[in-house]
């Protein structure tokens, strides 16, 4: 399943970097995110449950990120005009069945306000 | 697993239209592909196989495709500037397992020869 | 193509001990989750113990408790469980079998692939 | 601990013929966690269905499952030759646990 565009402020801006955010329902208990800039993977955390409810969390593609009962953040430093491309929040819902995949993305802008060194 | 940017001619223009290739490995057996401009679903075509492998297609969002043991081939017709995008092959494979999802894509750049109705 | 291929299984007098292994292949190892189940010949089936991806969640069923150790190494793509205290009951054919999303966890996910299974026999 | 009873025990049916195998838990099975598998002599299982009604990468169109809470049933709808075997359903909502079994048989 692929939502599209993403209904929520997706990109907030601070310090010349970005913070990303990808949601998911909150009643997800384990699941797999993946940060898509295009195509290529840029991060990938993973949560996993065991019994007594510890939880495990897997960064494959290791990102700064910040996890929420609801979303994961994550961030991106030192933005410059490359960083400009559509940006995908892929997540894997492995918990509660069925397994779901969905697709949420949009287009990061870079405005000269939100570089991290301009020129004075 | 994904792929990134289409290591393939992705894009095949003829009469004022273009062929969008969209490929997957000859041994899946049923599969989602969906094509993306930016982060909106413009098609969705899912194959599934039943008893005596009798193949099920299903077409969410109906565009023109063409189908073979190896790709999907989506057509848009009547191009025009507007075209110009990011487009995005997003595969979910079901059989064999384990699920996976691939998202390949490139960016369609129009130029005057290509569109469908240029003025004289 | 993926195989789950257990070994270890033998007989053994109650109260020895014996170490099954499950060697897998044609798989990313630690994508999965992975569980020990047991069959009693011509009987159901019983789920042993399950571990994550990396090893730190673990679990048992009530049976084992304290008696059985699940581990796993993924640098050599092998499963683990260590079997203390044996039991007459305890006599069945083990499988391990592997979480069928590739999600890294045991808990709360069904599976798919399994082994062909090896056989413990506890008896004097 | 949740207990899974499947009934009937044994089912004796003709190939071509609907197969309707019941697994009733003795407490609620949360948000659906309950797999059903196949089994055949001297093989491992092989999942069919998860969360109650969901096939199988593989599986054939003619299995399907339903239910939910403390009652769960597997349809196959026209028995094939090779569907003649043991069926076990499963909760993974907590520690797994898996019903008796129903054999299905050739009449």
């Known amino acids: 399943e692929i939502n599209g565009s993403a209904n929520y402020e997706m990109f907030i801006f601070h310090n010349g970097g970005v913070q990303i955010l990808c949601k998911y329902p909150d009643i997800v208990q384990q699941f797999k995110m993946q940060l898509l800039k295009g195509g290529q993977i840029l991060c990938d955390l993973t949560k996993t449950k065991g019994s007594g409810n510890k939880v495990s969390i897997k960064s494959l593609k290791f990102c700064h990120s910040q996890l929420s009962n609801n979303s994961v953040s994550f961030f991106l430093y030192n933005l410059d005009r490359s960083h400009a491309n559509y940006y995908f929040c892929n997540l894997s819902i492995f918990d509660p069945p069925p397994f779901k995949v969905t697709l949420t993305g949009g287009y990061l802008h870079i405005y000269e306000s939100q570089l991290c060194c301009q020129l004075k | 697993e994904i792929n990134g940017s289409a290591n393939y001619e992705m894009f095949i223009f003829h009469n004022g239209g273009v062929q969008i290739l969209c490929k997957y490995p000859d041994i899946v057996q049923q599969f989602k592909m969906q094509l993306l401009k930016g982060g909106q679903i413009l098609c969705d075509l899912t194959k599934t196989k039943g008893s005596g492998n009798k193949v099920s297609i299903k077409s969410l969002k109906f565009c023109h495709s063409q189908l073979s043991n190896n790709s999907v081939s989506f057509f848009l017709y009547n191009l025009d500037r507007s075209h110009a995008n990011y487009y995005f092959c997003n595969l979910s494979i079901f059989d064999p397992p384990p699920f996976k999802v691939t998202l390949t894509g490139g960016y369609l750049h129009i130029y005057e020869s290509q569109l469908c109705c240029q003025l004289k | 193509e993926v195989q789950l291929v257990e070994s270890g299984g033998g007989v053994v007098r109650p109260g020895g001990s014996l170490r099954l292994s499950c060697a897998a292949s044609g798989l990313t190892f630690d994508d999965y989750g992975m569980s020990w189940v047991r069959q009693v010949p011509g009987k159901g089936l019983e789920w042993v113990s399950g571990?994550?991806?990396?090893?730190?969640?673990?679990d048992y069923a009530d049976s084992v408790k304290g008696r059985f150790t699940i581990s796993r190494d993924n640098a050599k793509n092998s499963l683990y469980l260590q079997m203390n205290s044996l039991r007459a009951e305890d006599t069945a054919l083990y499988y391990c079998?592997?979480?069928?999303?590739?999600?890294?966890?045991?808990?709360?996910?069904?599976?798919?692939?399994w082994g062909q299974g090896t056989l413990v026999t506890v008896s004097s | 601990e949740i207990v899974l009873t499947q009934s009937p025990g044994t089912l004796s049916l003709s190939p071509g013929e609907r197969a309707t195998l019941s697994c009733r838990a003795s407490?609620?099975?949360?948000?659906?966690?309950l797999a059903w598998y196949q089994q055949k002599p001297g093989q491992a299982p092989r999942l069919l269905i998860y969360g109650a009604s969901s096939r199988a990468t593989g599986i054939p169109d003619r299995f399907s499952g339903s239910g939910s809470g403390t009652d769960f049933t597997l349809t196959i709808r026209r028995l094939e030759p090779e569907d003649f075997a043991v069926y076990y359903c499963q909760q993974y909502g907590s520690s797994p646990f898996f019903g008796p079994g129903t054999k299905v048989d050739i009449k």
């Open positions: 407490q609620s099975v949360s948000s659906s966690y």
């Open positions: 079998a592997r979480d069928y999303y590739g999600s890294g966890s045991y808990y709360n996910v069904p599976f798919d692939y």
């Open positions: 571990i994550n991806w990396n090893g730190d969640n673990t």
